[in-house]
């Protein structure tokens, strides 16, 4: 699997999850989240050659098409597969609220 | 929705489904499919700016991050959303077989 265990410990050039830390204030301009100040969101990057963690029958076909037509703009793209939630604390007035923001952290990628 | 109805009738520059015809023999090197000779597979292409058909909370955050950091390599990508099957005819010996190949035709796209 193209997950953090594999990707963070390798020098994989193909589609893999990469490290990205997002600071809510500096990177997004968000003040409303009290805790945490930022988080390891990660992101997906890298080419999707034939048979590399392909998602569907279509992405297999498209990767093979791309193999035969390397100049074509049609190619699978490296996108998140498994996402995890992020617990946050924010305030409504003076009342702290705890919420899980769903689908916030990329754990693995796929070629779609 | 970024589907064939909208995308094929507009000059949309952002993420949208685009027309692509794949000839099984010429484009994939496949001889095993007897009918059809090829099909309209389509593909997804175009940038994914802030709020453009974003798939998850993560892709919204990443698009906003990208808006503030335009040089960053972390950005959502335009990929298939709705896929449809393709009925094919192939031969096993002299016996024709009809099969549905699932997830073969792109009907709509999303930013993931």
């Amino acid at each position: 699997a193209l997950d953090t265990n594999y990707c963070f410990s390798s020098t994989e050039k193909n589609c893999c999850v990469r490290q990205l830390y997002i600071d809510f204030r500096k990177d997004l301009g968000w003040k409303w989240i009290h805790e945490p100040k930022g988080y390891h969101a990660n992101f997906c990057l890298g080419p999707c050659p034939y048979i590399w963690s392909l998602d569907t029958q279509y992405s297999k076909v498209l990767a093979l098409y791309n193999q035969h037509n390397p100049g074509a703009s049609a190619a699978p793209c490296c996108v998140p597969q498994a996402l995890e939630p992020l617990p946050i604390v924010y305030y409504v007035g003076r009342k702290p609220k705890v919420e899980q923001l769903s689908n916030m952290i990329v754990r693995s990628c796929k070629c779609s | 929705a970024l589907d064939t109805n909208y995308c094929f009738s507009s000059t949309e520059k952002n993420c949208c489904v685009r027309q692509l015809y794949i000839d099984f023999r010429k484009d994939l090197g496949w001889k095993w499919i007897h009918e059809p000779k090829g099909y309209h597979a389509n593909f997804c292409l175009g940038p994914c700016p802030y709020i453009w058909s974003l798939d998850t909370q993560y892709s919204k955050v990443l698009a906003l991050y990208n808006q503030h950091n335009p040089g960053a390599s972390a950005a959502p990508c335009c990929v298939p959303q709705a896929l449809e099957p393709l009925p094919i005819v192939y031969y096993v010996g002299r016996k024709p077989k009809v099969e549905q190949l699932s997830n073969m035709i792109v009907r709509s796209c999303k930013c993931s």
Epitope: R25, L28, G29, W30, K31, W32, Y90, V92, L101 | I51, L54, Q57, K60, L64, H68
Partner: nanobody, 114 residues
Framework: QLQLVESGGGLVQPGESLRLSCAAS????????MAWFRQAPGKQRELVAL???????NYADSVKGRFTISRDNAENTVYLQMTELKFEDTAVYYC????????WGQGTQVTVSS
């Protein structure tokens, strides 16, 4: 029920100014990233300007130096001050709010014509 209501659109001549307003209700406005988008006939909807809850702003290249986005958290309103309007600014302008999910207003027409 969440509502975004735009106002301030109209017919102006090139070089003139307009101020659009978007009043929000039913969301935590002060936490929301607010944005203005526009859609000209036969064109895609495009981002014009956005302002985060931390007052960080971002503008489309075509409006930089002419348009200013601002917000009033006490009034739950976001504004778009448009100056030196051009023919190509003609479009329906939509207000957008993003907090946990995205919300849209119905739009207000801006026409620049001589």
């Amino acid at each position: 029920q969440l509502q975004l209501v735009e106002s301030g659109g109209g017919l102006v001549q090139p070089g003139e100014s307009l101020r659009l307003s978007c009043a929000a209700s039913g969301i935590i406005f002060s936490a929301s990233t607010m944005a203005w988008f526009r859609q000209a006939p036969g064109k895609q909807r495009e981002l014009v300007a956005l302002i985060t809850d931390g007052d960080r702003t971002n503008y489309a290249d075509s409006v930089k130096g002419r348009f200013t986005i601002s917000r009033d958290n006490a009034e739950n309103t976001v504004y778009l001050q448009m100056t030196e309007l051009k023919f190509e600014d003609t479009a329906v302008y939509y207000c957008n709010a993003f907090w946990l999910k995205a919300y849209w207003g119905q739009g207000t027409q801006v026409t620049v014509s001589s």
